[in-house]
Structure formats: C-alpha cells, structure tokens
C-alpha cells in the first residue's frame, strides 16, 4: 500500500507565439482545479477508462481575475498536494491523466460552471520510494509544470511497496530469513504471510503463500529435519555434544542481494539473480537495458546490450523522447482556432471547441445560444462566444443538467434560513429584512437622520451583509 | 465593483409622478438584487421597493399600488415609476444593490425627490 503524490508547480501559457486567452475575466472571474487519474502499465487506453490505480480531485484555487488587456499570466493555484492512496502493490509502470478544469464564477444563482481548460496524459516509469520526478505537459497553448513521486505506506518497502517493515525485537539482528529494512537499518522486514502451517521457526517465504525451508529442515511445510546420520554439512565446526556439524554462517545469511534480488550460494561465493532495472554483484546498481524493454510506443531499442552501454530509442513517427514517452506534440502549431481545444488522438487532430464555435478547426463562429437548450428550464444568455445558462431553482452546471441542492449556494440572505420545497427553496427572513432572498434590509443598520450613505461608508462602497 | 448613479429626482406637485432612474456598472443588473431606499430629513432611511435577482418584487405598504420597480436589463438600469405623489414622499432616494457572489451591497449617492405645491 502506498500513496501517489502529484504536485502542480504552474499552469500558463506555453513557450512560443499565440498565448492563450485568460481563461478567466473580470466579467466571469473563476478559479481552477485539477484531477489526476492513474492506471497500472503502459498500455494505450481511452481517457475514458477507468482509474484502476486512483483518481483525485484537488482543492479549488484562489479566484483569479483576469486584468484587462495583460496576457494570461500563470493562473494561481490550489494549495498542496494531489494524493491518490493505492492499495496494492505499486506497479512500477503507469499511465496518468491531469486535467486542469476551470469553475466560473458568474452572478448567476444557479452556481457555479465547470468546463475543461486542459488535459495532458502520458506513461512513466517510477519506482516507490524514489525522488520526485519533475514534468513539463503541453496542451494546445498551456503548458503544466508539475512533480509526482510514490511512496509506500508503512510498513511496506520497497520499490513495488510489497516488502513489508516492522521494528527489531531484538536490538542485535533481524530474525532468520530476514533482512534490515534500508534505509530504515533499525528495522527488519517482517515475514510475508507464508503458506498456512509453515513452521514459523524453520521455515520461511519470500513470496506470499510459499514455506521455503532453512538449513537443515524439508517438508512442505519446513518441519521435517534433515537426515543427520552422516553429518555431512560442508561447513561449521563439529559439535561437541552430538558429533555432527553445525552450520555456521552462509554466504546468503542476511540475503546481501539488494534491491529484491534473491540470493543462491555457489561453491565458492554466492550469486545474485537481480530483478529488472538492477544489476551488479549485489544488484545494488541501478541500470536499464534494452531487455528491460525501456521505449515505449514501438519504439526500437539499440545498444545497451551491457549495462555500461546506454541504449537508445529510436521512436515511430508520432513520439519522441528519450524513452518515446511523449507524443510530438502538433497542437504546439495551434490549429484550433477562437481558444479551441486541441487533442491529439495519434491518428488524427480533434478541436474541441468553446461554446459558440464550429468546424473541424472551431473556424465557424455560431449564434452562443443558437441550438444550445439549457436543460431543466434554464435561459441561455449570450456573451462573448461562450453560452451560459442561468439555471432554474434547483439545477445547476453548464448545461443545467445537474441537479443542486437549492440550500447549498446560501441562498438565503442575511442569515435568512433556508427550506428546500417543491417549488424551489424559501427563505425566512431575519428580522428586519425583507425580499424574496431576504436580500433586503428594512432600515439599513445604522442610518441615522440624513447621511449620505450608511455610516462609514462612501455613497457606492460596498458593504459585508452576510 | 458595482457603481449605482441614480437620476430623474426632482420638483413634483402632489399627485403628480416621477421616474427614478439607477445606471448600475460593473456587473449585470439581471445577476444583481437591486432596491429603491429612501431617507426623509430626521427619519431613519427606509425600503421603499425591492427588485429580486429572480424578478420577484416587493413594496412597502404605503407605496404600494402607487410605485412600479421595473429592470432593463439591456440598459443594465433599474428604475423606480412614481405616481400619486404624496408631501410625505419627499425625501432622498437612495438605489441600492446586492451582489450575490460576493454578498455585498453597493449604494448610489442620491437623488432629492420634493413633493411641494
């Protein structure tokens, strides 16, 4: 078990000519949030598809205002971290999704709007426990900046987060069969769940669900001893009181593979079968081979048929990188027109176009609200290329399709109480105001014989009623 | 922010009518919960009528039947329609409005109604 972490450092317009329009205005000022999916592998999948590894959505950022005529600058941003927990084991390769959404922050009543402003994806490689591993995404004209990085949950270890730690009972040593846990040296890995019955004394398992046996002991469950009657243990002094020999330490005790090789003794030494990604005496260098299967996409390996030797990806047309991890990315030349969207599908370009606009390249510019029905009642209202709908009572989103709680948007006026009904809400007035939201003080607090305007106040000052 | 600047106070003989107008920028008076107040010399400053931002209206009972809140939203104005005026109309009237996204209210400067024979 573990967490993945993604850290958003900026969202902006990219390098090169054509920035972006804010998506913001002090007409529609909005703020933004971001939503990260997860899936285990490399494999090309729809953004539709599940997030079978997680999915999180982070906290809202500040409202922003777009100042008139200044180039959309890096938009502000939530506070902390993007968490997405997974269960099981960390599956070393993934592919993620971030989507950088925008809520509008109109008068309307109805709530705010959401519509998507980005969505870069793309497939990795990462091992728990490791640094964080800064990105740049490109999406049309924006550009996201962020770091990610998987760390295991205690007690798990570990680069897939599958080995397990707990503290030493003993101050001296970690039980037979089990290693420290690097790099937390004051403890030990606790044994796996082995098969059931496993003698917990002789036997031992370094997968779940297996009884492999210590020197000296066999059976299936590692509690039959060995025959002693020829006492012809290779190694250890003779013991006194039995005659045979008694096994001394092994060139595995203490297993000096690292990074989850696994150890088998040779005549003279011994040997360490190293998992993918490691090689060296003790597995204790990290290095990739074109065995390793390192380029993505169909991309071909070459070179790095020994680990001294770097290999090199040449990537099929569409993908680049060191590892052919990215997409080229022809939205970088802008096609979509009037702020479209662009995506790249591979095999072809898609706009997505902003409310308003049609055509392949969002070229054509509609009527706002010609043929955009609000649902549930709602009106649409035009304005500068984009429809909006003031919902009806009890609905909100874009569209009005989704359903809201009338309560929930304080509608409601100086501490007026709310009451969902029917029909919409009501409200129930405070004393002292009046209106169909209560919107209304009866004599504002205060005034007194003839000021110009409430005490304290310039005539036009906004004033807090909450 | 919003800015209210009302208009069309004035003179009136009693009986006689006047409109009121209120410009508002800086938002849409559609979004905006908007009122007529108004402060006679030595009283306190009172609703007069109220123009809700779903369009639901309300009056003061010694108004009603006599004054009309209406909205334009296409000039982004507000107005007040006052007919049978009374001596005791007389008085500052003030226009006022509620902004729900941020729960602020906003006022005008006034304008001088004075119903005299």
């Known amino acids: 078990a573990g967490v993945f972490e993604l850290q958003i450092h900026s969202f902006g317009p990219g390098p090169g000519p054509g920035a972006p329009r804010s998506p913001c205005s002090a007409r529609l000022p909005c703020r933004l949030f971001f939503r990260v999916c997860l899936k285990p592998g490399l494999s090309e999948e729809a953004a539709e598809s599940p997030c079978a590894l997680g999915a999180a959505l982070s906290a809202r950022g500040p409202v922003y205002t777009e100042q008139p005529g200044a180039p959309a600058p890096d938009l502000p941003l939530p506070d902390g971290l993007l968490q997405v927990p997974f269960r099981d084991a960390w599956p070393g390769t993934f592919s993620f999704i971030i989507e950088t959404w925008r809520e509008e922050l109109g008068d309307q009543i109805g709530g705010p709007a959401w519509s998507l402003l980005a969505r870069v994806a793309g497939r990795r490689r990462l091992a728990a426990g490791g640094p964080w591993a800064r990105d740049i995404q490109r999406a049309g004209a924006w550009e996201l900046r962020f770091s990610y990085r998987a760390r295991c949950e205690p007690p798990a270890v570990g680069t897939a987060c599958t080995r397990l730690c707990r503290p030493r009972s003993a101050p001296s040593r970690c039980g037979p069969g089990l290693r420290p846990c690097a790099p937390l040296e004051d403890e030990c890995e606790a044994p796996l769940v082995c098969r059931a019955g496993c003698s917990p004394e002789h036997g031992f398992c370094e997968q779940p669900g297996e009884c492999r046996c210590l020197e000296g002991w066999t059976g299936p469950l590692c509690t039959v001893p060995v025959s002693t009657s020829s006492c012809l243990s290779p190694r250890g002094p003779s013991s006194a009181t039995t005659g045979c020999l008694v096994p001394g330490p092994g060139p595995c005790d203490g297993n000096p593979c690292a990074n989850g090789g696994s150890c088998s003794e040779t005549p003279r030494s011994f040997e360490c079968t190293c998992p993918r990604g490691f090689y060296g005496l003790r597995c204790e260098v990290s290095g990739v081979t074109c065995a390793d299967g390192p380029c993505f996409n169909g991309g071909l390996c070459v070179g790095g048929a020994d680990p001294d030797s770097a290999y090199i990806c040449h990537c099929p047309p569409g993908f680049q990188g060191s590892n052919c991890e990215k997409r080229v990315d022809r939205c970088s030349l802008q096609p979509c027109r009037n702020g479209g969207l662009c995506l790249d599908l591979g095999h072809a370009l898609r706009c997505r176009c902003r409310a308003g606009f049609a055509g392949p390249r969002c070229e054509h510019d509609l009527d706002d609200c010609a043929g955009r029905a609000c649902a549930n009642g709602g009106t649409c209202v035009e304005g500068g290329g984009a429809h909006r709908c003031s919902c009806a009572l009890g609905f909100g989103g874009r569209d009005c399709r989704e359903r809201a709680d009338p309560c929930a948007a304080r509608p409601c006026a100086h501490g007026g109480r709310c009451y969902a009904h029917f029909s919409g809400l009501v409200c129930a007035c405070a004393p002292g105001y009046m209106g169909a939201r209560c919107e209304f003080p009866v004599h504002p607090d205060g005034a007194s014989a003839l000021p110009a305007a409430p005490p304290g106040l310039r005539p036009g000052d906004p004033q807090r009623y909450l | 922010e919003v800015q209210l600047v009302e208009s069309g106070g004035g003179l009136v003989q009693p009986g006689g009518s006047l409109t009121l107008s209120c410009a508002a920028s800086?938002?849409?008076?559609?979004?905006?919960?908007m009122a007529w107040y108004r402060q006679a010399p030595g009283k306190k400053r009172e609703l007069v009528a109220g123009?809700?931002?779903?369009?639901?209206?309300d009056y003061i009972d010694s108004v009603k039947g006599r004054f009309t809140i209406s909205r334009d939203n296409a000039k982004n104005s507000v107005y007040l329609q006052m007919n049978s005026l009374r001596a005791e109309d007389t008085a500052v009237y003030y226009c006022y409005a509620y902004r729900w996204t941020t729960r602020l209210t906003y006022w005008g400067q006034g304008t001088l109604v004075t119903v005299s024979s």
């Open positions: 123009i809700s931002a779903d369009g639901s209206k």
């Open positions: 800086g938002s849409k008076v559609s979004f905006l919960s």
